[in-house]
Amino acid sequence: KSCPSVCRCDAGFIYCNDRSLTSIPVGIPEDATTLYLQNNQINNVGIPSDLKNLLKVQRIYLYHNSLDEFPTNLPKYVKELHLQENNIRTITYDSLSKIPYLEELHLDDNSVSAVSIEEGAFRDSNYLRLLFLSRNHLSTIPGGLPRTIEELRLDDNRISTISSPSLHGLTSLKRLVLDGNLLNNHGLGDKVFFNLVNLTELSLVRNSLTAAPVNLPGTSLRKLYLQDNHINRVPPNAFSYLRQLYRLDMSNNNLSNLPQGIFDDLDNITQLILRNNPWYCGCKMKWVRDWLQSLPVKVNVRGLMCQAPEKVRGMAIKDLSAELFDCKDSGIVSTIQITTAIPNTAYPAQGQWPAPVTKQPDIKNPKLIKDQRTTGSPSRKTILITVKSVTPDTIHISWRLALPMTALRLSWLKLGHSPAFGSITETIVTGERSEYLVTALEPESPYRVCMVPMETSNLYLFDETPVCIETQTAPLRMYNPTTTLNREQEKEPYKNPNLP
């Protein structure tokens, strides 16, 4: 059997890739099934008319070439066509109708625009399952896509609108990727995803959504990616009926709270990722803590870390005690108990919680003060922390545990005057350890240090509020204060003066 001299032929696999070819070589054997022609300089003129006679060819790799039109003269029974990284601008019915058995079409990194896809171009493509159009020039989703499509990738285009009808017939679609486009909520036609009854994965990462989309298909959606948008609102019905959803990611948005019960329908959720949102841990978010504490072990929730108000900044929502949510109508006030070894005059904390004090403040209304814990009794997992400023940029943290623990989460945060200021650093320390040296801090700056037991379960039997302490790094002239905090040393609770 012949093989073009510039190629290598091996049992139906024809390797003509990376040869600087400007045309497809003549003499490809008739039993060829796969043509590797990638990484050449083949242009449209260089596709010979007799290529269509190779009726056994099922896969053609023509990516990274010099095609500026959709190629013609392709073998009729081709199933996989890889045309990435060319300069193809148009998709016509004439070219697609000649390869009606196509199942996968890879057109990533070309120059296809919405107007350059001929209306009805895909009307005879009744076997097409995968259509990849990432990194093209699309401003909208092309209409008239075949209803056989199972995966549609349109990431990194310029899509600002999706028309209601464009996706409506795609009842076989399982995976839709729209990352890195220009979509806002106005650009999403009404019920645009609603009829995608087999959709299991929807990705809208890196767009301009300000609200989580509604009317999502509930029958089969399993993964929903909404990270890196501008979402500041989740409509109460956004996740209704999404009973199959197991992964939801809304990281890197602008969410400060969530409507109560928003996750009620998510019967199968196992991964909920909400990192890097400005969560405001006020009364509206108390339900989230209660919900988190009721979750089974299999549910993995990440990123619910308070950014405001300042008194709880840096704390995990699930670790907050009920009193810290400031639900004024509940009659609950803070009952955190703190002692300190810092003299009054030495580097007092700057109005952050918990404020180191040396005496109990006056209690205006003792009847209002009640220590509400989930078990009705104080937590027995007492941690006594001592913090010492060793050098202007280093603090030494040591702790004692009343009960043995497998691990603890240690975090520290430079305090500032706005929620956007400062970043939380955390580390996991094993239960056997009793000290930790934090370096590379800023001199003469206030820090909050928190410790909390690391639980293996999300079912809480004790009050797991973090034990926190504030300290200040020494000025460049050396000073070594020592601060001690223990939630259970005080005999009587008192109202935190910094709380309203």
Partner: antibody, heavy 120, light 107 residues
Framework: QVQLQQSGPELVKPGASVNISCKAS????????MNWVKQRPGKGLEWIGW????????NYNGKFKGKATLTADKSSSTAYMQLSSLTSEDSAVYFC?????????????WGQGTLVTVSA | DIQMNQSPSSLSASLGDTITIACRAS??????LSWYQQKPGSIPKLLIY???NLHTGVPSRFSGSGSGTDFTLTISSLQPEDIATYYC?????????FGSGTKLEIK
């Protein structure tokens, strides 16, 4: 070729209901959305909604929810629109219209229209 | 709902003239716009779809342009048979909405 044949004119009393039909031929009826459009005498066009005969799934203009009910019978390739609780405001010509390619938003094929007159 | 603002509401021109009809959407509809011609007592007829694509059988003197929110229908070399009412339709979002129509008359 695509053809849409609508039922004849209807004279109905206020409060009653009416059923309009649209028989399709020349294409795969189950695969293309069927739209319905209202035109009052001397006035413009209003989109009522569309139905996908393949599974009976319908989408309505909110203005016509409760007023219009769209159904389809695949076996006879016929789409139906029922209008209920009729008032004089419902007196109009009603068109069925098919999209150019199955389910896009432009209507290339139109029925001849059915005139509904609501009068006591 | 997306509003379609069509202007002018009526237009009088001479045979052979070039006329334009404008349609403005209340929000971005990309290229999801079509134009229809309706003669008195007749059904609407598709002229232009996808903002600029001429439908089969429509004379080439009809053309459409625009994207986003602003669209125009142009009829060059006006003919007597062009006397009709013209409508735009947005197909971007449910509910689909028509413009209010432009009635074209011959001077």
């Amino acid at each position: 070729q695509v053809q849409l044949q609508q039922s004849g004119p209807e004279l109905v009393k206020p409060g009653a209901s009416v059923n309009i039909s649209c028989k399709a031929s020349g294409y795969a009826f189950g695969n293309s959305w069927m739209n319905w459009v209202k035109q009052r005498p001397g006035k413009g066009l209003e989109w009522i909604g569309w139905i996908y005969p393949g599974d009976g799934n319908a989408n309505y203009n909110g203005k016509f929810k409760g007023k219009a009910t769209l159904t389809a019978d695949k076996s006879s390739s016929t789409a139906y629109m029922q209008l209920s609780s009729l008032t004089s405001e419902d007196s109009a010509v009603y068109f069925c219209a098919r999209a150019l390619y199955d389910y896009d938003g432009w209507f290339a094929y139109w029925g001849q229209g059915t005139l509904v007159t609501v009068s006591a | 709902d997306i509003q379609m603002n069509q202007s002018p509401s009526s237009l009088s021109a001479s045979l052979g003239d070039t006329i334009t009809i404008a349609c403005r959407a209340s929000q971005n509809i990309d290229i999801w716009l079509s134009w229809y011609q309706q003669k008195p007592g007749s059904i609407p007829k598709l002229l232009i779809y996808k903002a600029s694509n001429l439908h089969t059988g429509v004379p080439s003197r009809f053309s459409g342009s625009g994207s986003g929110t602003d669209f125009t229908l142009t009829i060059s070399s006006l003919q007597p048979e062009d006397i009709a009412t013209y409508y735009c339709l947005q197909g971007q979002s449910f509910p689909f909405t028509f413009g209010s129509g432009t009635k074209l008359e011959i001077k």
